[in-house]
Interface confidence: medium
């Protein structure tokens, strides 16, 4: 067991190595190790193969170090890995696309304040095994076609707190059995028409926070599951073309966020629910 | 790292106000809800009151409705709670809890302010 | 009176896997969003649950939740004396803005 950590066999092998000031991974983890815990260290690069030997490893955590690279291939011959949380290393900035390859039964993957500013093409590639995906609090500006695509049971995307500023047509193609999404406290002022077409099994989606003057109710109507709508602090323009909005929101049966609209100035605070259809005059 | 620091608890009489703040740090303060919540001496938990990142929206329990005003300078990363007309059964540890993770959820807490409101 | 119902106390010993229960009407539990907290003693609650079923980042993964009609459940496995302490579950209302804790369940580890 390395110096700076404990390790012990019951419930699960785990070495725990968690605050202890270590600047590397430390060498002579045991192979049989189930569970890493090297979180809240100052751990900066994670190298190739560094745990490679833990071929029955689950849980790996390193979130809270200042890592600023991690090798493409440092979770090589992880195959049983289900939890990686590589949260709060703002220094980051961006991951290979193909850390992740490889990680067949990944369920829960943790990268939110990581500094991120792109998402690699196929990064999450083959990870058809995950549910659970943090991204929030990045430096995101894009959500490029089909980065989602592979993630058929993902259940729940963290998007939050990122510089989104449109969400186009194919940005979360393949989420067949999302639950949630938070796009909120972005800069999201464009929505396609087609861009949740997958999200027949949506429950929650929060849009508030964002640059949102108009969306299309197109958009809204694959959403058949879904039950909490969030649209709250936007630039909503109540004029001609938020008829459709309205019209949707009042047959909306699931419980919906004030959507007060900004113009024209003499409806400006007013809750686009509550109106009347004769109140959205003019384009 | 996510800190969130409570102060301006004391004793007070039945009858007198109380404002109560909530210094915050390590996180973009002015995207997220923040909430209070109190605990009486030897209870449970109960939410008090929150507020939208912006500061636009506000909600209370119906126990301080009226009393309580909740508000944020986002340009100090400070929540107060402004606490009028206090009773004895006001009397507990007040925490800020973050919204992180959206409204459903309290994801961070502070350590807490005790105010007794007592003759 | 909590609308949230909890068990007052829970017992176990180390090693056991030990559940606690949170129960209510259906548009408490089931149209809700459901929050499990940990308040060991002389410290603020902790999160280890929220979206019903969703680990907290950094807590163990001996803690799981579930939620089904009219109730809501936290296990914890492989118990530790650790564990002692207060439970909680929290159920909000997108909509309605309001938040509810259950009364909450004292574990205590023997």
């Known amino acids: 067991c390395p110096g700076a950590c404990v390790c012990y066999n019951e419930p699960k092998v785990t070495t725990s190595c968690p605050q202890q000031g270590l600047q590397a991974v430390p060498v002579g983890i045991p192979a049989a190790s189930q569970r890493i815990f090297l979180h809240g260290n100052r751990i900066s690069h994670v190298p190739a193969a560094s745990f490679r030997a833990c071929r029955n490893l689950t849980i790996l955590w390193l979130h809270s170090n200042v890592l600023a690279r991690i090798d493409a291939a440092a979770f090589t011959g992880l195959a049983l890995l289900e939890q990686l949380d590589l949260s709060d290393n703002a220094q980051l900035r961006s991951v290979d696309p193909a850390t992740f390859h490889g990680l067949g039964r990944l369920h829960t993957l943790h990268l939110d304040r990581c500094g991120l500013q792109e998402l690699g093409p196929g990064l999450f590639r083959g990870l058809a095994a995950l549910q659970y995906l943090y991204l929030q609090d990045n430096a995101l500006q894009a959500l490029p076609d089909d980065t989602f695509r592979d993630l058929g049971n993902l259940t729940h995307l963290f998007l939050h707190g990122n510089r989104i500023s449109s969400v186009p047509e194919r940005a979360f193609r393949g989420l067949h059995s999302l639950d949630r999404l938070l796009l909120h406290q972005n800069r999201v002022a464009h929505v396609h028409p087609h861009a949740f077409r997958d999200l027949g099994r949506l429950m929650t989606l929060y849009l508030f926070a964002n640059n949102l003057s108009a969306l299309p109710t197109e958009a809204l109507a694959p959403l058949r599951a879904l039950q909490y709508l969030r649209l709250n602090d936007n630039p909503w323009v109540c004029d001609c073309r938020a008829r459709p909005l309205w019209a949707w929101l009042q047959k909306f049966r699931g419980s919906s966020s004030e959507v007060p609209c900004s113009l024209p100035q003499r409806l400006a605070g007013r809750d686009l629910k509550r109106l009347a259809a004769n109140d959205l005059q003019g384009c | 790292e996510v800190q969130l620091l409570e102060s301006g608890g004391g004793l007070v009489q039945p009858g007198g106000s109380l404002r109560l703040s909530c210094a915050a740090s390590?996180?973009?303060?002015?995207?997220?809800?923040m909430s209070w919540v109190r605990q009486a001496p030897g209870k449970g938990l109960e939410w008090v009151s929150a507020?939208?990142?912006?500061?636009?929206?506000?909600y209370y329990a119906d126990s301080v409705k009226g009393r309580f005003t909740i508000s944020r300078d986002n340009s100090k990363n400070t929540l107060y709670l402004q606490m009028n007309s206090l009773r004895a059964e006001d009397t507990a540890v007040y925490y800020c809890?973050?919204?992180?993770?959206?409204?459903?959820?309290?994801?961070?807490w502070g350590r807490g302010t005790l105010v007794t409101v007592s003759s | 009176q909590s609308v949230l119902t909890q068990p007052p106390s829970v017992t176990g010993v180390p090693g056991q896997r030990v559940t606690i229960s949170c129960s209510g009407s259906?548009?408490?539990?089931?149209?809700?969003?459901i929050s499990w907290y940990q308040q060991l003693s002389g410290e603020a609650p902790k999160l280890l649950v929220f979206?019903?079923?969703v680990p907290s980042s950094g807590v163990s993964d001996r803690f799981s939740a579930s939620k089904s009609g009219t109730s809501a459940s936290l296990a914890i496995s492989a118990l530790r004396s650790g564990d002692e302490g207060d439970y909680y579950c929290?159920?909000?209302?997108?909509?309605?803005?309001?938040?509810?804790f259950g009364g909450g369940t004292k574990l205590t580890v023997l």
């Open positions: 809890a973050l919204h992180y993770y959206g409204l459903g959820s309290f994801d961070f």
């Open positions: 259906t548009s408490m539990i089931e149209r809700a969003d």
């Open positions: 979206a019903n079923v």
């Open positions: 507020i939208s990142g912006s500061g636009g929206s506000t």
């Open positions: 390590g996180f973009t303060f002015s995207s997220y809800a």
């Open positions: 929290a159920a909000f209302h997108d909509g309605l803005n309001d938040w509810v």
